[in-house]
Interface confidence: medium
Amino acid sequence: GSQHIRAEKAMVDGSWLDLAKRSKLEAQPFAHLTINATDIPSGSHKVSLSSWYHDRGWAKISNMTFSNGKLIVNQDGFYYLYANICFRHHETSGDLATEYLQLMVYVTKTSIKIPSSHTLMKGGSTKYWSGNSEFHFYSINVGGFFKLRSGEEISIEVSNPSLLDPDQDATYFGAFKVRDID
Amino acid sequence: GSQHIRAEKAMVDGSWLDLAKRSKLEAQPFAHLTINATDIPSGSHKVSLSSWYHDRGWAKISNMTFSNGKLIVNQDGFYYLYANICFRHHETSGDLATEYLQLMVYVTKTSIKIPSSHTLMKGGSTKYWSGNSEFHFYSINVGGFFKLRSGEEISIEVSNPSLLDPDQDATYFGAFKVRDID
Amino acid sequence: GSQHIRAEKAMVDGSWLDLAKRSKLEAQPFAHLTINATDIPSGSHKVSLSSWYHDRGWAKISNMTFSNGKLIVNQDGFYYLYANICFRHHETSGDLATEYLQLMVYVTKTSIKIPSSHTLMKGGSTKYWSGNSEFHFYSINVGGFFKLRSGEEISIEVSNPSLLDPDQDATYFGAFKVRDID
């Protein structure tokens, strides 16, 4: 009898260990992707940034996928999404095409099942980067809490990509799962 | 027999209560530190800010340590780190050394085991604070998701510390643990 | 005997399922509220924004309440609060009252029990929006980790509400519970 009980207890413990592991904080998906400066588009037009690191320096990913320039959701849930985008210009890089700039970021969500793209968050500023100053810098930060479904894709669009700061501490975006969908 | 089973059940319940307590949300480390305005360095150079409150007003800390101007990690994990830094100047404070300013924040991580310091996040802007206006203000916000090991230290560096806004709602930084390391 | 043990096991499983459900990530309160542009106050003075969507587009709420322009906490805990506020002006909207603007956001907490209102976070910038440019834009982002009690209310104040960008990806605020209070 006592042996039988212990076997039952082990079963209980075992099943709970599985459940605990599944629901434990370490199972939660996340990503922190940093700009890959070797492949930043030129120009001042609005473009989708497709080159990001996911496994070097501060960049990392778990239970999400990075493919074709997009961060792909593998697990339904509510996620906190964020992006930090830095722009800079030094006079040694040559003249700006225009001193009046619109420095913007757009965090977009694409659904493959229903082919559509929507902007979740935007931020930025119009700037007057006068030739009187040798150096100009500006950073944007956005963040918000969104419901994401498996298969949906997150991407980053910016204006003036040629002005992006290529440092890993400057230009990055990320996500982490906070809770399940009810 | 029945008594024995209840004892076994209590054991199961007890061990799970321990596990639940350990993994419960309330065990997760966090900190929200607000600027201590009584000790802000002067000047316009880049400095590390060492005076922060951790236990008054909005400032609070749990399962992390604040020492020597640094936020010390006590528990391995993935943390969301953030900082909000406000700069301001009123003409009644006297002249600005220069009207062209670089207002910046750097969130740095120091590892004691391998003595090294790295910038995790940066943000800011170059500003032209003209004498045409009696008051100037600018805020920076940065945030990101990082793997932190026990013993690592987080600190804040800024340019132009004499221009910092000393309010607790203006100049602060913080961290909260989101998940364990796999 | 074996049947009895199974009944006990079911009890153990059952009670743990309750606890698991209670502590599961899906029970955590959150809100993401987007600006309701049909009712933005005019003028350049500082006002409390009372019209927000909570159930359309990106806007959503769970285990929190939105009432009378305020986000009401229903569950004690530590929450991450955030706001993203965008301002914009196009010359086709007519001249600005002044070219020198103070574009600000204040995230405030009101306690009903002890009638008082306090600013948790502020951000923004003074801007010179010259008539030389046809379009102006500026975004603010703030975020921080705060202890909130049931019944407390979060609201958003801004300067220059007539300049707010009415898009759901531009002007929003939110909160999500991270952990219990010890």
């Epitope: - | 003409e91 002249d95 003209s130 004498g131 045409n132 | 010259s130």
Partner: nanobody, 122 residues
Framework: EVQLVESGGGLVQAGGSLRLSCAAS???????MAWFRQAPGKEREFVAA????????YYADSVKGRFTISRDNAKNTVNLQMNSLKPDDTAVYYC????????????????WGQETQVTVSS
């Protein structure tokens, strides 16, 4: 319409003094005001500037200690008291308002007066 009208120029001997005045009309708010000068065959150069409150003043190195800029916001005027004048100070003097790009940069001012001539003889 914004108008800046200068007065007070003239001919003076080296070591003497002059007081230039600039009266502003049509300004909806008080701005940084400045004086610039341009000698024959030379670039326009910064002389002095004063912020809207009058608390902050800037001077070119060549005039520091000799020239004083002041303003009277009630009357919308800015004055330049020039002492210990030298022949090198001979130039056409301009009043300017509303610094957009930096106080010392002539390209950065939105409003300009006509001019007033200052001649310092040796």
């Amino acid at each position: 319409e914004v108008q800046l009208v200068e007065s007070g120029g003239g001919l003076v001997q080296a070591g003497g003094s002059l007081r230039l005045s600039c009266a502003a009309s049509g300004l909806t708010t008080v701005y940084t005001m400045a004086w610039f000068r341009q000698a024959p065959g030379k670039e326009r150069e910064f002389v002095a500037a004063i912020t809207r409150s009058g608390k902050t003043t800037y001077y070119a190195d060549s005039v520091k200690g000799r020239f004083t800029i002041s303003r009277d916001n009630a009357k919308n005027t800015v004055n330049l008291q020039m002492n210990s004048l030298k022949p090198d100070d001979t130039a056409v003097y301009y009043c300017a308002a509303k610094a957009l790009l930096g106080m010392t940069n002539p390209a950065g001012y939105e409003y300009w007066g006509q001019e007033t001539q200052v001649t310092v003889s040796s």
